[in-house]
Amino acid sequence: QEDEDGDYEELVLALRSEEDGLAEAPEHGTTATFHRCAKDPWRLPGTYVVVLKEETHLSQSERTARRLQAQAARRGYLTKILHVFHGLLPGFLVKMSGDLLELALKLPHVDYIEEDSSVFAQSIPWNLERITPPRYRADEYQPPDGGSLVEVYLLDTSIQSDHREIEGRVMVTDFENVPEEDGTRFHRQASKCDSHGTHLAGVVSGRDAGVAKGASMRSLRVLNCQGKGTVSGTLIGLEFIRKSQLVQPVGPLVVLLPLAGGYSRVLNAACQRLARAGVVLVTAAGNFRDDACLYSPASAPEVITVGATNAQDQPVTLGTLGTNFGRCVDLFAPGEDIIGASSDCSTCFVSQSGTSQAAAHVAGIAAMMLSAEPELTLAELRQRLIHFSAKDVINEAWFPEDQRVLTPNLVAALPPSTHGAGWQLFCRTVWSAHSGPTRMATAVARCAPDEELLSCSSFSRSGKRRGERMEAQGGKLVCRAHNAFGGEGVYAIARCCLLPQANCSVHTAPPAEASMGTRVHCHQQGHVLTGCSSHWEVEDLGTHKPPVLRPRGQPNQCVGHREASIHASCCHAPGLECKVKEHGIPAPQEQVTVACEEGWTLTGCSALPGTSHVLGAYAVDNTCVVRSRDVSTTGSTSEGAVTAVAICCRSRHLAQASQELQ
């Protein structure tokens, strides 16, 4: 997931003028940007979140807010500062005329300004059966640990805390930040107001129908009786959680955000800050049958984003819409006809559907995992959620064709046992945003801060690409894919793994040009090959066929086209061992795959040769997939022959450490 896409509207106003004699004039050429929701009906003009630069202190935030008010007053405009942010993001929330935006963007310390917008609740007992490992029966669902060491924060509607399902399990905080309900004849009915939040609290920790029956919860009211809230209200809620965490540090925290609005830079940024403070955030992918990357907080990379499936492992349809999908979704979970607490009475139950319910399941699973292993980081938790998911059970035909390859075919499940997974080398696949179709366009896929980028590949539906390479960016390796002229755009695909004490580097060989092919190997002692990438500066690689792939005795080697530069990812980590596995098909075929065997984890996936009829390579779980152009257009010459190259690794060190624990 990345904060890079969305039909997100960005209006940039340059900081040129120094009118009003600003004491701290911005540097020449810097720009503050204005953002607003791409979905017009969801916009809330007149209220703005002014986000200040990262190191801005509270006193500077207050001073900047006062300066805005003073300069606005001089122009005859009234403004009202509704909230000053600190703890998560520096900035303030201001009610003012849109005419003042240009002025506000010129204030010192301003990074960007975002117009406020709406967020919405995302809802419309096989569920326990799906997430329960085969050895349990759903009717005797007794989780090994009910999540008792974990606190789950729920940002939602008000809740009926005396419902039998959740009584004594949910503490209602005094936090409330909701907009007025729409419509003049709206009658607040407690049961309606509490409906969404009560149901979700029950799904997470309900006595009878809850996933993590031991988890304690705290509720914050950010959605009104119509299930509607604001980005600003959600931000203030997240800030409240951060401040609570600082005042009274407890065990692991899970924050459930069963809501969605249009793509929001500021909401994503707040989620990132909270996640980096050690909080696990789980959110609904959204119920818009659309790309989840167009919504927030679903598009925030640090958040665990959950789509919804039904009892038949079909993506959930909700009226004319349904679950969101795409690369910003981490996994799916039960989200149709979920039985849970009803706010109609203290013993009532009701079924609800939506990605909110799916997210609640994952929040419950996360609570249980964290209760069993409280030291798990967000990266470790996400990798475990992916690892223990049911694989390849979703019928992908429901998704738009161009989204199928990007959408994870994973349905959340509880681990068979809450201990003993430590020996596993965990990896996941991260897709970039689409590059766009111009010649110079590139796409970048990034791993989470605690993960290692072990390999990098690329994919283009048109086949027009210039390969990919691993490069350093801000002290971390990223995976960058390059489009070619006439291409419809590329994706970069990163293989992101948990590899403690790893020391990884990239070795590059420039194009060999004169010889048969380019080669590069891991020459440092103790370093093993985890991935191969190739990048070419020419628009079209010839049909040159590389030589025999890897001479015997040289497994630590990447080979490729003579006009390409080849990049080897070489890692040293205690007990790490890797091997290359290849599957070649002499006749042209649209898809060639090779999988790592049990006990080994796929770290690298690439194609040979790198010629133009190869669309690219990517990892799906433990299988390396190489896609080629339609057989009918390739002909059946030897040029159509493609080899899928997988690099499979395991860590003896992790295995030993795990055995010692047991």
Epitope: T438, M440, A441, F485, G486, V538, E539
Partner: antibody, heavy 118, light 108 residues
Framework: EVQLVESGGGLVQPGGSLRLSCVVS????????MHWVRQATGRGLEWVSG???????SYTGSVKGRFTISRENAKNSLHLQMNSLTTGDTAIYYC????????????WGQGTLVTVSS | EIVMTQSPATLSVSPGERGTLSCRAS??????LAWYQQKPGQAPRLLIY???TRATGFPARFSGSGSGTEFTLTISSLQSEDFAVYYC??????????FGPGTKVDFK
Amino acid sequence: EVQLVESGGGLVQPGGSLRLSCVVSGFTFGDYDMHWVRQATGRGLEWVSGIAPAGDTSYTGSVKGRFTISRENAKNSLHLQMNSLTTGDTAIYYCAREDIAVPGFDYWGQGTLVTVSS
Amino acid sequence: EIVMTQSPATLSVSPGERGTLSCRASQSVSSNLAWYQQKPGQAPRLLIYGASTRATGFPARFSGSGSGTEFTLTISSLQSEDFAVYYCQQYNKWPPFTFGPGTKVDFK
């Protein structure tokens, strides 16, 4: 009508800096790769730098580390920040567009003259 | 980088005559080659792309051919408005995109 208008050229001393701008109209700026190409007096054309809609950049070797290309899609403007200028950078600087369907630079500005001299 | 060379440096022809300009690449550029026309005091104009496709606004008397390393621009019957400098440019391998030094077409 497609138009590209450069500005910001002038006389600068060696080691100095200059910021060129190119404002465009007549097409959706954010859909195109944009480039700077220079031409020393009486000499040939030299590609300097290019930038994709999302901001991916590329430079010729002689300017890497000294020049920075940037764009503001909402303002239909392209920029070239030139630092540590040398006499070898003296030229007319053109901004040019590349279409996704037509390879090569299909529209050019009228150019702005940069003179580096002590 | 790919080095582009053009010959002749100057081509002197009379109006109505045929003009042939050559461009050579230091390594294969496939058909990824463009030609530009530049008149004094003006910006260059894209004339040919893909080695042989004429850009909009140019008449049929201009034609391009070649692939790999050898390319030709032919002006079948030179008109007075065709007297200019012509540059070839490769966009097969980049960065950088490279131009030839130019051929000046002037009156005999």
